[in-house]
Interface confidence: low
């Protein structure tokens, strides 16, 4: 029987619902449908339709309430600037097609802030930032008119306000009203006008979510307030005592759908993993909800700061858990969060007011029962004493992020719930949660975690040195002999670990150049410390021209490094930092770390190489299991080692071996890679296990890395577990906490 004929009460026929130039998919077991158009097109006049109780689909109505007979996919346009103050833009057009560009310039006496050139993107949004022409005459700077919005108010004195509006049919995201505050900042966040077809791309979300959560502050801790003249950026700080509560609130109602629920869970697992990788332990609260909320993890539970345990609880939640009561009562869910925040008998725990609260709500924004959830956000603000004291408003202590999921998102609702902070975005509308796992990268303010080892800023906007912040470039200038290039790794504020063979006994400190963080300037060197057992000529009499056993050196710098996002240390084995990085118990021994990092098998690792002035990660396998012997035996193919009778003469227990074609074809190191770290990447952290020493085959002749290399092209690295007593002795004042 055709589905349309044998339909249950309140279900609708699919006859005539097609869309010209696109397709549709059913949602909520046939109670709604979503029109899907190719990239660069949007469904006109509506994106979704609901099945009415009469058995007919909701009417196709335009924004000005005209009825349309058939849906169609239309080309996406970007809105035109309704107004542009104190300047001109060109070209002028009623609308702009994807890839069109506009340019802004200011009248004399006005300076342009934001983007001078903007491009219409495939999602109907303009690239770049709002262009603003400002003459600096106001107490606050001109807040601008985001394209598509209209602004009322052109006085920017202290406590003056401006309001923003959208054209009919568009929804305002951000702050409708902004007030000029002490310190010269505007309250709230920049508005924008959203059409129903607009989604945030994963990249946009990643960038905005990330930058909001990683905003930094200069100087004052929020608890102690700050003077009115000091304009602040915010930060979310996780200090090691774990003074942050993160509440994960997940909509499990009918309207969300099982696949989005699963996707949201994946994102949150990723988020927990990312936060944990920072070596800090926020407490988690975990709530799912439909008609009623269900608290899976309370922040007061002993294990709520155990990331692995919280992840396990999250993974065990089923979409079906709310099946019988499948309304959407967001208010009740937030009340569950409120109950976790509040303390019994009004007696707060020590440090209550240094605890930062982050609510991450994933919903379709369609609350259909229980009342307006915004009232609970107000209660939470009241409880945390936020916005009560003009001098110390404590706004930093609460962040509400709302991820609207799926085509039925009610933009007004999700915007109302989200925090509004200057230059930050807390509300996101996403098509599919599965796309969003890359969103949950860096969670916290760097300033508190800069000293954490093996941390990287893995965002797409990051430079090479954001991604490899430990990497050091070493150059030795030898008069009349050219120069030698090596790599090294920052291991503490004063030391860079590298290979001893990069230097000769004749090299003077002033002829050794070290640079870090991609900076042009060279660092002054105090001394180079060689491993006492290193002697390249140690086996010359035995016919071994070069002997690389104990090929490690530490460069001590004259001045302390200033850690930042592009300069920070790598983790060393058998230190407390590595214990924390691997999320092992504090009682972990050096042997247990070794078993974790170098088990008797093929171990996935990486090294960093410079190719065409770019740093790239190369994935290799350390042969530490059944392939170890054959890997080491290939050393006989190295120039000068062909006469060696017993390969253990040159491949001592100090070496780790990589390269070859099994289990995968490993890339090889080049001469300039020597001294660089061999790294194991675990739990989002980077731990150095070796120092690149020597290779069997020079695969980089003529400055080009050969694509085809023989199977015996192996590389040998000094195993740091084998030189720990020396490292421990030389780095004893560096606070690394050797085990």
């Amino acid at each position: 029987t055709p589905w349309s004929l044998a339909r249950p009460q309140g279900s609708c026929s699919l006859e005539g619902v097609e869309i010209k130039g696109g397709s549709f998919r059913l949602l909520q077991e046939g109670q709604a449908l979503e029109y899907v158009c190719p990239s660069g097109f949007y469904p006109y006049p509506v994106q979704t339709r609901t099945c009415r109780s009469t058995g007919s689909w909701s009417t196709l109505k335009t924004q000005d309430q005209k009825t349309v007979r058939k849906a169609e996919c239309r080309a996406i346009h970007c809105p035109r600037p309704h107004d542009f103050e104190n300047g001109e833009y060109w070209p002028r057009s009623p609308y702009y097609n994807v890839s069109d560009e506009i340019s802004f310039h200011c009248y004399d006496g006005y300076t342009l802030r934001g983007s001078a050139n903007r491009t219409c993107q495939v999602n109907g949004r303009w690239s770049g930032q709002t262009a603003i022409c400002d003459n600096g005459a106001g107490y606050c700077s001109n807040p601008g008119i985001p394209i598509g919005t209209r602004k009322v108010g052109s006085q920017y004195r202290l406590e003056d306000s401006v309001t923003y509006h959208c054209s009919r049919g568009l929804t305002l995201r951000g702050s409708q009203r902004r007030t000029c505050q002490e310190g010269g900042s505007w309250s709230g966040t920049e508005p924008s006008c959203q059409d129903s077809f607009m989604y945030d791309t994963p990249q946009e979300v990643a960038e905005a979510f990330l930058s909001s959560l990683t905003e930094t502050i200069e100087g004052v801790d929020a608890e102690d307030g700050h003077g009115p003249g000091e304009q602040q950026k915010r930060k979310i700080v996780l200090d090691p005592s774990g003074s942050m509560n993160i509440y994960l609130v997940l909509d499990g109602s009918d309207s969300i759908g099982a696949s989005n629920f699963t996707g949201a869970k994946k994102c949150l697992v990723n988020l927990i993993e990312k936060v944990a990788s920072y070596g800090v332990k926020p407490r988690y609260g975990l709530v799912t909800y439909a008609t009623y909320p269900k608290i899976w993890v309370k922040v007061s539970e002993a294990d709520s700061s155990n990331a692995d345990w919280v992840t396990k609880q999250l993974n065990e939640i089923n979409y079906e858990d709310h099946k019988l009561k499948s309304g959407t009562n967001t208010k009740k869910a937030l009340q569950a969060v409120y109950s976790m925040m509040s303390w019994p008998d009004d007696v707060p725990p020590e440090g209550w007011n240094r605890t930062r609260h982050v609510i991450i709500l994933m919903t379709d924004g369609l609350h259909n029962m229980g009342g307006d959830p915004i009232t609970v956000i107000d209660e939470i603000r009241d409880l945390l004493y936020i916005g009560k004291d003009r001098k110390n408003p404590r706004e930093d202590y609460l962040d509400v992020y709302v991820f609207g999921v799926g085509p039925l998102v009610n933009q007004v609702n999700i915007n109302a719930l989200a925090s509004k902070k200057d230059n930050e975005q807390h509300v996101f509308k996403v098509k599919d949660m599965e796309n969003l796992e890359d969103v949950f990268y860096q969670m916290i303010d760097e300033s508190q975690s800069l000293s954490l080892c093996g941390m990287v800023w893995e965002h797409r906007k990051g430079t090479d040195y954001h991604k490899q912040p430990w990497q050091a470039k070493i150059s030795v200038i030898r008069p009349s002999k050219g120069h030698e290039s090596c790599m090294g790794a920052v291991v503490s504020e004063y030391f860079v670990l590298t290979a001893a063979h990069c230097f000769t006994v004749d090299d003077k400190e002033h002829s050794i150049k070290v640079s870090v963080g991609g900076e042009k300037r060279d660092l002054e060197i105090e001394v180079v410390l060689f491993h006492p057992n290193y002697n390249i000529n140690g086996k010359k009499e035995a016919g071994i021209p070069e002997f690389y056993d104990y090929d490690v050196a530490l460069i001590k710098l004259k001045n302390k490094l200033k850690y930042g996002q592009t300069i920070r240390p790598i983790c060393l084995p058998c230190t407390e930092g590595t214990t924390r990085a691997l999320r092992l118990p504090p009682t972990t021994t050096c042997q247990q770390q070794k078993e974790e990092l170098l088990p008797a098998q093929d171990i996935k690792a990486l090294f960093v190489s410079e190719e065409e002035k770019k740093l790239t990660r190369k994935e290799v396998y350390i042969k530490n299991g059944d392939k170890k012997g054959s890997c080491e035996r290939d050393a006989q193919y190295a120039p000068g080692y062909d006469k060696v009778k017993d390969i253990s003469e040159v491949v001592t227990p100090r070496f780790l071996c990589t390269g070859g074609v099994s289990p995968y074809a490993d890339p090889n190191t080049c001469r300039g890679d020597s001294g660089g770290p061999l790294i194991v990447h675990k739990r989002s952290r980077f731990i150095q296990v070796g120092v690149i020493s020597w290779g069997v085959v020079d695969v980089c002749k003529n400055q080009k890395r050969q694509k085809q290399v023989p199977a015996h092209a192996r590389d040998f690295h000094i195993n740091l577990f084998q030189v720990l007593p020396w490292l421990k002795e030389k780095l004893q004042d560096e606070d690394l906490g050797f085990l």
């Epitope: 707060p348 240094r354 009560k388």
Partner: antibody
Framework: QVQLQQSGAELAKPGASVRMSCKAS????????IHWVKQRPGQGLEWIGY????????DYNQKFKDKATLTADKSSSTVYMQLSSLTSEDSAVYYC??????????????WGQGTSVTVSS | DVQITQSPSYLAASPGETITINCRAS??????LAWYQDKPGKTNKLLIY???TLQSGIPSRFSGSGSGTDFTLTISSLEPEDFAMYYC?????????FGGGTKLEIK
């Protein structure tokens, strides 16, 4: 037990300054804010401001911003209030009181006995 | 600033009676209202905070109620030592403000 011991009565001339003290004992000094309250003869109570002894951060009632200066000495667990440019309007009893732990909206749970200031030429 | 109006300003009662004192805020202060007792020769005593929470060590005949803008202090079966000056104070928003006080005297 918690005690706030205030310094003795002050007699001052108009235009002069006075500095009174409030010595805390019986609890961790740096964990609680100290508030100051004014009471003129036969009148009600007025909140002057508070200081966080741990950080020295303070906030004042706008009305007393140019009148009172609050400081704290952690080593002696003592908070000081200086009143400047005295006039007859400043003749009053001044109380120090302990606020909630680290500034929670808890009321003032322990009070000093008060310091009487008389401004007269 | 939040204005606090306290009534009555004067009240006469006998031991054993129950009395109430009211305070009204000029805008909502949630539940954050405190009540104090002021007796000559003694330091001021906190009785109630957060509208209805009894400070430790205070007898249970003292109770507070209310939220938003209207609050009440009730003293049931008055004891001789209860005759004193009583003040309410909002501790919701700086600057903190006090009611004008109620003098409770023996009838």
């Amino acid at each position: 037990q918690v005690q706030l011991q205030q310094s003795g009565a002050e007699l001052a001339k108009p235009g002069a300054s006075v500095r009174m003290s409030c010595k805390a004992s019986g609890y961790t000094f740096t964990n609680y804010w100290i508030h100051w309250v004014k009471q003129r003869p036969g009148q009600g109570l007025e909140w002057i401001g508070y200081i966080n002894p741990n950080t020295g951060y303070n906030d004042y009632n706008q009305k007393f911003k140019d009148k009172a200066t609050l400081t704290a000495d952690k080593s002696s667990s003592t908070v000081y209030m200086q009143l400047s440019s005295l006039t007859s309007e400043d003749s009053a009893v001044y109380y120090c009181a302990r606020g909630g732990q680290l500034g929670l909206r808890r009321a003032m749970d322990y009070w000093g006995q008060g310091t009487s200031v008389t401004v007269s030429s | 600033d939040v204005q606090i109006t306290q009534s009555p300003s004067y009240l006469a009662a006998s031991p054993g009676e129950t009395i109430t004192i009211n305070c009204r805020a000029s805008k909502s202060i949630s539940k954050y209202l405190a009540w104090y007792q002021d007796k000559p020769g003694k330091t001021n005593k906190l009785l109630i905070y957060s509208g209805s929470t009894l400070q430790s060590g205070i007898p249970s005949r003292f109770s507070g109620s209310g939220s938003g803008t209207d609050f009440t202090l009730t003293i049931s079966s008055l004891e001789p030592e209860d005759f004193a000056m009583y003040y309410c104070q909002q501790h919701d928003e700086y600057p903190w403000t006090f009611g004008g006080g109620t003098k409770l005297e023996i009838k």
